[in-house]
């Protein structure tokens, strides 16, 4: 086991962390925008799930050295509509390729201060962080 | 802020946790099996993304009070194949509804022991936990 600088350096433990709880959602660094590339707007017949999907997507790295996990990946849709199951390339306007979002629990490393305000190592602050997980082929919403 | 029982209850801090790091994946409580219901194997024209998808799914709660996050949700596919974009109900055998998996970082509360082996509150142990996020409509793999 390896540890951070201690929040409360007691004899018994090499490192302890204060977990602070907060459920304010934190927006991703960039909006999880659509990212249409006609060249890659196709459903492959092999490879990983995100390339075989008829709503294909790529993953974009979001790295923050003071967050746990440090690396998160945001899905970016490659097509506005779903790709035809028959051809794997032509788009079918009857289906939309939509991002699936999730508020993931993450932890931020923050300076934590003692009673007298002195710096006491690092503490962990829990947050919800919005991540786009995948692109999903859906039927368009019919407004009633 | 709310906290778990303290790992080292010092005067300065209401709660500290020892973070122990391990990356051995932990299997979910139940295998993320397929869960086909012909009655619900349809793509809705309204409602949340998982019901409008042509690879619809439901969520199953996985709760563990000694884990952070305590509540995780596993996707369960409602259809073996994708639903037709045209009808929203008939299945199209040219497309498979497949689970998308992700190894999520979670933290487990474990008893942590002092130098002499005495119980000293709780520690947090980091693990990777396999979660099924969604069902995706994919073109079947063509073996080369």
């Amino acid at each position: 086991y390896s540890h951070w600088p201690s929040c409360c350096p007691s004899k018994g433990y090499p490192s302890e962390e204060l977990l602070r709880w907060s459920t304010v959602p934190v927006p991703p660094l960039k909006p999880a925008s659509l990212d249409f590339h006609s060249v890659s707007c196709r459903a492959s017949e092999d490879g990983p799930l995100n390339s075989r999907a008829i709503s294909p997507w790529r993953y974009e790295l979001d790295r923050d050295l003071n967050r746990l996990p440090q690396d998160l990946y945001h899905a970016r849709c490659l097509c506005p509509h779903c790709v035809s199951l028959q051809t794997g390339s032509h788009m079918d306007p009857r289906g939309n390729s939509e991002l699936l979002y999730h508020n993931q629990t993450v932890f931020y490393r923050r300076p934590c201060h003692g009673k007298k305000g002195n710096h006491k190592g690092y503490c962990l602050e829990r947050r919800l962080y919005r991540v786009s997980l995948a692109c999903v082929c859906v039927r368009p919403r019919v407004m009633g | 802020y709310s906290h778990w029982p303290s790992c080292c209850p010092s005067k300065g801090y209401p709660s500290e946790e020892l973070l122990r790091w391990s990356t051995v994946p932990v299997p979910p409580l139940k295998p993320a099996s397929l869960d086909f219901h012909s009655v619900s194997c349809r793509a809705s024209e309204d409602g949340p993304l998982n019901s409008r998808a042509i690879s619809p799914w439901r969520y199953e709660l996985d709760r563990d009070l000694n884990r952070l996050p305590q509540d995780l949700y596993h996707a369960r596919c409602l259809c073996p194949h994708c639903v037709s974009l045209q009808t929203g109900s008939h299945m199209d055998p040219r497309g498979n509804s497949e689970l998308l998996y992700h190894n999520q970082t979670v933290f487990y509360r474990r008893p942590c022991h002092g130098k002499k082996g005495n119980h000293k509150g709780y520690c947090l142990e980091r693990r990777l936990y396999r979660v099924s996020l969604a069902c995706v409509c994919v073109r079947p793999r063509v073996m080369g």
């Epitope: 990983p48 995100n50 790529r58 993953y59 790295l61 050295l65 746990l68 490393r109 | -």
Partner: antibody, heavy 125, light 107 residues
């Protein structure tokens, strides 16, 4: 022993494209991110982007978004960079570099700890 | 993007000298700084990561220091094989950025 073996020099016409390969050996290919770096005129180093071989996840410097396409072939432990719509400005030496991560865990530090020998690309008619 | 500046583009020193190469960032990079060595044949090696930690196999005559926006690489006893160009690189935020390089030559 960690090694990154890059493909040989390329001479390409303007408007064309080129694919550079970087074959990794001596470590678990999917366990480390791969970076690509451009060196123009034998001087400045410019980061192009990176790819995680495990999930294909990428990050690019904005100006290389439509220019460089990063891919991997896990079966052969090879990373590729395709450069599109080439102009004389793209003439440079291109390096692949493995990104190592260092303690204290779990808050890693990142550094390009092993580099390929470089691939020279010349764009000329 | 974070700009990295190495104000000295070339530097001459004698064998055995103590040489310091500086690097500054356009904003605080919290010690998230690496140093690389590029030999005249184009070979690039990692020397130091996280401001001051020597990469495995790097001689102890190399050392790094700094904080905030200002960093430096020191070679305590210059050897002939140290003739190279040295680059700093920040990894505080993507995109990664490099300094312009400092070419070290023998007097």
């Amino acid at each position: 022993e960690v090694q990154l073996q890059q493909s040989g020099p390329e001479l390409v016409k303007p408007g064309g494209s080129v694919r550079i390969s970087c074959k990794a050996s001596g470590y678990s290919f999917t366990g480390y991110t791969m970076n690509w770096v451009k060196q123009s005129h034998g001087k400045n180093l410019e980061w192009i982007g990176l790819i995680n071989p495990d999930n294909g996840g990428t990050s690019h410097k904005q100006r290389f978004m439509g220019k460089a396409t990063l891919t991997v072939d896990k079966s052969s432990s090879t990373a590729y960079m395709e450069l599109l719509s080439l102009t004389s400005e793209d003439s440079a030496v291109y390096y692949c570099a493995r990104e190592g991560y260092y303690g204290p865990s779990p808050f890693h530090h990142y550094a390009m700890d092993y580099w390929g020998q470089g691939t020279s690309v010349t764009v000329s008619s | 993007d974070i700009q990295m500046t190495q104000t000295t583009s070339s530097l001459s020193a004698s064998l055995g000298d103590r040489v310091t190469i500086s690097c500054s960032a356009s904003q605080d990079i919290s010690n998230y700084l690496n140093w690389y060595q590029q030999k005249p044949d184009g070979t690039i090696k990692l020397l130091i990561y996280y401001t001051s930690t020597l990469h495995s196999g790097v001689p102890s005559r190399f050392s790094g220091s700094g904080s905030g926006t200002d960093y430096s690489l020191t070679i305590s006893n210059l050897e002939p094989e140290d003739i190279a160009t040295y680059y700093c690189q920040q990894y505080s935020k993507l995109p990664y950025t490099f300094g312009g390089g400092t070419k070290l030559e023998i007097k």
